[in-house]
């Protein structure tokens, strides 16, 4: 943990600009609050300053969690984790953020989707996701349905399907009915990762039944 006691950083971009340019876990402070949260900062990719808000890489963390757990975050910032919807909502309503989603398949390929505008609505509005300005190599159509859906978990069903997507597909996500993606689905190891309806899905890159090897969701201020 690289936080200095006197430093107050809202995101990894502020950490980077303060001179801390090494990848690692830093303590961030909620906007307009003294509440703190630990996050992994990627200080190397694409110029650095990225706040990692989600990571899947080995199946070591269970992502079939409750609304409250997705709200406050869970897992280990140095490995698989979810940073927390409340922090991300507060942060992305302060200024304009970009969202980059980096994906790896089991054949050694990598791809990304970059959204030039990203924010989450408040909890009152079920942390609805808002995305605009898609570019990248992981599909010309957004695998997160647009305009964004409300967030759903196993105990908080806000999707557009009578089927309860979060229970059926596992994991909390911005499900439609149920939609073309779920990066918080079941982790399937190699050779068990095809024809899986409830895996880690990004439809417009790998199709509906392919479960990915690794995913990272990261945000950074647009004016970084």
């Amino acid at each position: 943990d690289y936080k200095d006691d006197d430093d107050k950083f809202r995101d990894c971009a502020e950490v980077f600009k303060s001179g801390h340019t090494t990848n690692g876990i830093y303590t961030l402070t909620f906007p307009n609050s003294t509440e703190e949260i630990k996050a992994y900062c990627d200080m190397e990719a694409g110029g650095g300053g990225w706040t990692i808000i989600q990571r899947r890489e080995d199946g070591s963390v269970d992502f079939q969690r409750t609304w409250k757990e997705y709200k406050v975050g869970f897992g280990n910032p140095s490995g698989e984790y979810w940073l927390g919807n409340e922090f991300v909502s507060q942060l992305t309503n302060q200024q304009r953020y970009v969202l980059k989603i980096h994906l790896k398949d089991w054949e050694g390929n990598e791809a990304y989707s970059l959204y030039e505008h990203f924010y989450l609505s408040s909890e009152e509005l079920n942390y609805r996701i808002h995305l605009k300005g898609l570019t990248g190599t992981a599909g010309k159509i957004s695998s997160i349905s647009q305009p964004g859906n409300d967030f759903s978990t196993k105990d908080g069903d806000n999707d557009k399907c009578a089927c309860k997507c979060s229970q059926m597909l596992t994991g909390g996500w911005w499900f439609d009915a149920c939609g073309p993606s779920n990066l918080n689905g079941m982790y399937y190891p190699q050779r068990q990762n095809t024809n899986k309806f409830n895996g880690i899905k990004w439809y417009y890159w790998k199709g509906s039944g392919y479960s990915l090897k690794a995913t990272t969701m990261m945000i950074r201020p647009a004016d970084f």
Epitope: N93, R96, E116, H117, Y119, S121, E124, L125, R128, H130, K132, G133, L134, T135, K140, I141, S142, Q146, P147
Partner: antibody
Framework: DVQLQESGPGLVKPSQSLSLTCTVT?????????WNWIRQFPGNKLEWMGY???????SYNPSLKSRISITRDTSKNQFFLQLNSVTPEDTATYYC??????????????WGQGTSVTVSS | SIVMTQTPKLLLVSAGDRVTITCKAS??????VAWYQQKPGQSPKLLIY???NRYTGVPDRFTGSGYGTDFTFAISTVQAEDLAIYFC?????????FGGGTKLEIK
């Protein structure tokens, strides 16, 4: 259901200010989304004028920036357009509309019925 | 500003025909393009957003496609009630800008 209703004078004299009100029902303008003014000139050309977001931030069309102001009254769930120093070229039908994104320009899913404004002496 | 060049300006069609309208952006608009229908005496209505997504309640005879600079809107089987002006709009960059409109007239 979300409804938007424009109101204001139908006739404004040149060099004066045009002031319009948009009253929103069925959704709080402080909850989410951006709240826009768009105008349609005779001949059907559409022009986005600007918005006020749910957080209160504003964005204006650079072609109007020196003349336009969009404000709101959250207690009445209304937002307002003021356009200064009008000329006959500002004669148009003025619409208010909600866009599907709160921090930037976007497509607009709910529109008012429009109010016709003529600038003439 | 991104200029949206919409063609044609007028479409004279018969009920049952398939029609296609195109919009060309002066620079990339990603997939941030919407299509609106404006019937006589009414305000514009959103039909398509993010280039290809049909808005709630819009019949499936209306479709959109495209990415970058070239966008297409189609009505697979024109009906009498489709008489209207159709507009494209980019909202990739500010200010958002509209095409000049295509007037659809039924023979």
């Amino acid at each position: 259901d979300v409804q938007l209703q424009e109101s204001g004078p139908g006739l404004v004299k040149p060099s004066q200010s045009l002031s319009l009100t948009c009253t929103v029902t069925g959704y709080s303008i402080t909850s989410d989304y951006a709240w826009n003014w768009i105008r349609q000139f005779p001949g059907n050309k559409l022009e986005w004028m600007g918005y006020i977001s749910y957080s209160g931030s504003t964005s204006y069309n650079p072609s109007l920036k020196s003349r336009i102001s969009i404000t709101r009254d959250t207690s009445k769930n209304q937002f307002f357009l003021q356009l200064n120093s009008v000329t006959p070229e500002d004669t148009a039908t003025y619409y208010c509309a909600r866009s599907t994104f709160g921090h930037y320009v976007s497509s607009m899913d709910y529109w008012g019925q429009g109010t016709s404004v003529t600038v003439s002496s | 500003s991104i200029v949206m060049t919409q063609t044609p300006k007028l479409l004279l069609v018969s009920a049952g025909d398939r029609v296609t309208i195109t919009c060309k952006a002066s620079q990339s608009a990603s997939n941030d393009v919407a299509w609106y229908q404006q019937k006589p005496g009414q305000s514009p209505k959103l039909l398509i957003y993010y280039a290809s997504n049909r808005y709630t309640g819009v019949p499936d005879r209306f479709t959109g496609s495209g990415y970058g600079t070239d966008f297409t809107f189609a009505i697979s089987t024109v009906q009498a009630e489709d008489l209207a002006i159709y507009f494209c709009q980019q909202d990739y960059s500010s200010p958002p800008t509209f095409g000049g409109g295509t007037k659809l007239e039924i023979k």
